[in-house]
């Protein structure tokens, strides 16, 4: 599973479970970690570990928890007012452009460039030239002369909504 | 591909109110996360509220919690943001961010696919 919410993941809460607490909505809002009911009478708190509400809203639900891939690891897991963050493994990285999955970083630089920048779980290896010192945009290295990286660093959230 | 355009706004007094608008062309936008951030002169782009989608609920920072209503016409792939008891501090560019997906509303820059080129409000007596 990935990071996004269809509308089937919202399913509705049972509303009347004796351990949802209930609060009162300010200026027709519910606090974080909350939802409005639907008479919009009450907050209901998200259930811990399950669903979460990050901003004052009228969500009728609250959004539920994201679980990390096979291939991620769970750097904090999900409370009532913040979502799973999850990262990816060491040696994969995750684009902004492809949020979907973890891709492998490159082993090494194609021939005539050299590495300034490691694998890191939101980066691929960084390459440039050796005599300009532009960036190299190629996706599959050279085999022969590779340069080869270290393993990724810690540690930056992968979850995309913050 | 997604093009925002925004729209309504201005210079206003303290207290005032504006509506301000997003209109969105290229595809539509029915089944994505839509929002606004601002950037205030100096300071860095902020979340300001925003919807998961059509009828499904909505997000609000806490500093324009209840001054300012998010909305939404899918129909006519526009999102609006009426802002009401304007103050000093709520001056800034206003930038339309939509998210490819329903995912859960785009509070944070990254979670944004596409960025209007943004409306200024000025508050000031």
């Known amino acids: 599973e990935s990071a996004l919410i269809t509308q089937q993941d919202l399913a509705p809460q049972q509303r009347a479970a004796p351990q949802q607490k209930r609060s009162s909505p300010s200026e027709g809002l519910c606090p974080p970690g909350h939802h409005i009911s639907e008479d919009g009478r009450d907050c209901i708190s998200c259930k811990y570990g399950q669903d979460y509400s990050t901003h004052w809203n009228d969500l009728l639900f609250c959004l539920r928890c994201t679980r990390c891939d096979s291939g991620e690891v769970e750097l904090s897991p999900c409370t009532t007012t913040r979502n799973t963050v999850c990262q990816c493994e060491e040696g994969t990285f995750r684009e902004e452009d492809s949020p979907e999955m973890c891709r492998k970083c490159r082993t090494g630089c194609p021939r005539g460039m050299v590495k300034v920048g490691d694998c890191t779980p939101w980066s691929d290896i960084e390459c440039v030239h050796k005599e300009s010192g532009t960036k190299h945009s190629g996706e599959v290295p050279a085999v022969e002369e590779t340069v080869t990286s270290s393993p990724g660093t810690p540690a930056s959230p992968c979850s995309l909504s913050g | 591909e997604v093009q925002l355009l925004e729209s309504g706004g201005g210079e206003v007094q303290p207290g005032g109110s504006l509506r301000l608008s997003c209109a969105a062309s290229?595809?539509?936008?029915?089944?994505?996360?839509m929002g606004w951030f601002r950037q205030a002169p100096g300071k860095e782009r902020e979340f300001v509220s925003a919807s998961v989608w059509n009828n499904g609920g909505n997000y609000y920072a806490e500093s324009v919690k209840g001054r300012f209503t998010i909305s939404r016409d899918d129909a006519k792939s526009t999102l609006y943001l009426q802002m009401s008891s304007l103050r000093a501090e709520d001056t800034a560019v206003y930038y339309c961010?939509?998210?490819?997906?329903?995912?859960?509303?785009?509070?944070?820059?990254?979670?944004?696919?596409?960025w209007g080129q943004g409306t200024l409000v000025t508050v000031k007596p």
């Open positions: 290229g595809r539509s936008i029915s089944n994505y996360a």
């Open positions: 961010v939509v998210a490819r997906t329903p995912e859960t509303p785009i509070t944070s820059a990254r979670g944004a696919n596409y």
